[in-house]
């Protein structure tokens, strides 16, 4: 998948399995990740558990776990709030669109977290104090999580290597470095840039991510995907002149 | 080996103010530089771990990023602590210890808060 | 919990090889360089040699080098030490430890060489 | 490469005694940024190390308050403030500071 890290930095990811997304001492999160197509290195997410631990008089700990096709509106015993602690409303599950868009708010941490079905995968996105991000008392064990660290780099795709090669050959495959099998031959590199632009007009890192996922995987979806996640950047960043990250010159050979 | 504490450093002395254009670049530069240093001296304890060949890269990356120098001014982390999570002795009435923004208003005029996203392929 | 198991320790005889096994868990264990100590009977404690995280980069102690050979596969959670050429002086308890610097041990796993 | 000599090599102490064992490095292990990387491990009788101390005086996670690290350059102490029965085993200094790592040849702690 695709980060955006609470440093702004912007990596594709090849990781697979599970992996930490987030692991403080209020909060834990994991993903799980699966290849797109049999035998691709790119992979999306098919699992999301995030952990609220117990904190004081406000929320017991709680678990929500979302699956593909099974984006639940509560915690898995049911509830959707903090439990029966004095300040349990201080945790709190909303269902925006049901089966696709569920937003959770936890306020004693100053944190919302946004949870999308998109296709077939999820999509995850999240807006935290600096000292929550950093509320970390074994840096050893929990330190190494990707929404801090990102990915390791033997883990990275660099899709806008991928990107420029398409958008200067006209390929829709890169023959050395492809992180995936040829996906549907119907899916030129003109179409693919026609459909992104359609729903990102600006020509950042979200739209060369969206181009990238549809010459992998030839699913349309994969622009939604896009799509929502800057909306809800959009919604949770709170430097809005960094909404759009832009690529960087120097990755880019053959480019002013 | 403590690399991951550099990172923590680094990451609360800039937080909110490393945009490549911005006008804090000379600050973030020497957060950079501070972060740098406190890499090289991990590096005999963690030289053969993940977490310090992630941190020399990415330092390596937004060097070059920002045009920042290799030697010039450091700086020093900025920290604030935050109540300590699990349960509390204390049993407390009020529910603004449940509502962080209340009770970082005491302390601070306006927490930073950031943002982490993961999507499509 | 951090667990480090060694296997494959044994008799052999001098000039024979030997293939011993740690296998890791309760850790990420490709996230961090290993590792190979070992301690003569009744004697003190002597670096073998370490791995990193990634295998790029090994290190041995000069009373091994080009006999040894470290190796390990993150997939299995599993580090190796190879033996060959192996000499009476070799005879000691095997410990594989976690971290460039070693934190976490296992338990030891015994190598005899005699004829 | 460099040697660690520790002394004594047999240490009986009394219980609820303090004990001190010294390490001498044969050269300096402090960095030219100032750090020192020496650590202490314990070897209870029939058990695998344990690392005690970390960087000459940080105590490792789990490991009891009356054990303490001192020193710098080459004079190094562990030093335990009342000694216990499970206490008993070898403790040795280990240097990351120049390569190869190198051990100290063990000090035996033992009961009088």
């Known amino acids: 998948p695709h980060l955006r890290t609470f440093t702004d930095r912007f990596q594709t990811c090849k990781v697979q399995g599970a992996w930490p997304l987030i692991d403080n001492n209020y909060l834990n999160v994991q993903v799980t990740n699966t290849p797109v197509l049999p035998g691709s290195a790119a992979t999306a997410t098919s699992k999301l558990t995030i952990i609220f631990k117990n904190f004081q008089e406000c929320v017991d700990q709680k678990v929500y776990q979302a699956e593909m096709d099974e984006l639940p509106a509560a915690f898995v015993d049911g509830s959707k709030n903090g439990g029966d602690k004095h300040g349990a409303n201080s945790l709190k599950i909303t269902e925006k669109v049901s089966g696709q868009h569920v937003e959770i708010q936890a306020k004693y941490i100053g944190t919302t977290i946004v949870v999308r079905q998109v296709g077939r995968y999820l999509t995850f996105a999240v807006r935290m104090p600096e000292e929550v991000v950093n509320a970390v008392e074994d840096w050893d064990s929990q330190g190494l999580y990707l929404c801090l660290r990102g990915c390791p780099l033997n883990q990275q795709i660099d899709f806008q290597a991928f990107h420029t090669n398409a958008e200067g050959t006209g390929a829709r495959r890169l023959a050395a470095a492809s992180p995936a099998p040829t996906a549907p031959e119907t899916f030129p590199y003109e179409t693919a840039v026609a459909k992104c632009k359609e729903k990102l007009p600006v020509e950042d890192l979200y739209y060369q991510a969206c181009v990238f996922d549809l010459l992998t995987t030839g699913d349309v979806n994969f622009t939604l995907a896009a799509y929502y996640a800057l909306e809800d950047v959009k919604m949770l960043h709170s430097n809005k002149d960094k909404l759009h990250l832009y690529e960087r010159t120097r990755d880019l050979p053959g480019r002013a | 080996c403590k690399i991951l504490k550099c990172n923590s450093e680094f990451w609360s002395a800039t937080s909110g103010s490393h945009a490549p254009a911005s006008d804090d670049t000379p600050e973030f530069c020497a957060a950079l530089r501070s972060y740098a240093l406190c890499t090289r001296r991990t590096a005999r304890t963690c030289r053969g771990d993940l977490a310090y060949h992630s941190a020399v890269h990415g330092i390596e990356d937004l060097m070059s990023q920002h045009n920042c120098s290799k030697d010039g001014p450091t700086s020093q982390p900025r920290l604030r602590t935050l109540p300590p999570a699990g349960d509390s002795q204390e049993r407390s009435d009020s529910p603004e210890i449940c509502h962080y923004e209340k009770s970082f208003h005491k302390h601070s005029a306006t927490p930073n808060y950031t943002h982490c996203g993961l999507f499509g392929d | 919990e951090v667990q480090l198991v060694e296997s494959g320790g044994g008799l052999v005889q001098p000039g024979g090889s030997l293939r011993l096994s740690c296998a890791a868990s309760?850790?990420?264990?490709?996230?961090?360089?290993m590792n190979w100590i070992r301690q003569a009977p009744g004697k003190g404690l002597e670096w073998i040699g370490m791995i990193y995280y990634d295998s790029s980069e090994k290190h041995y102690a000069d009373s091994v080098k080009g006999r040894f050979t470290i190796s390990r596969d993150n997939s299995k959670n599993t580090l190796y030490l190879q033996m060959n050429s192996l000499r009476a002086e070799d005879t000691a308890v095997y410990y594989c430890a976690k971290g460039t610097t070693p934190d976490y041990w296992g338990q030891g796993t015994m190598v005899t060489v005699s004829s | 490469d460099v040697v660690l000599t520790q002394s004594p090599l047999s240490l009986p102490v009394t219980l609820g005694q303090p004990a001190s064992i010294s390490c001498r490095s044969s050269q300096s292990l402090e960095t030219s940024d100032g750090d020192t990387f020496l650590e202490w491990f314990q070897q209870r009788p029939g058990q695998s190390p344990r690392l005690l101390i970390y960087e000459v005086s940080n105590r490792f996670s789990g490991v009891p308050d009356r054990f303490s690290g001192s020193g710098s350059g080459t004079d190094f102490t562990l030093k335990i403030s009342r000694v216990e029965a499970e206490d008993v085993g070898v403790y040795y200094c280990f240097q990351v500071t120049h390569d190869p790592v190198t051990f100290g040849q063990g000090t035996k702690l033992e009961i009088k």
């Open positions: 309760g850790f990420t264990f490709s996230n961090y360089g």
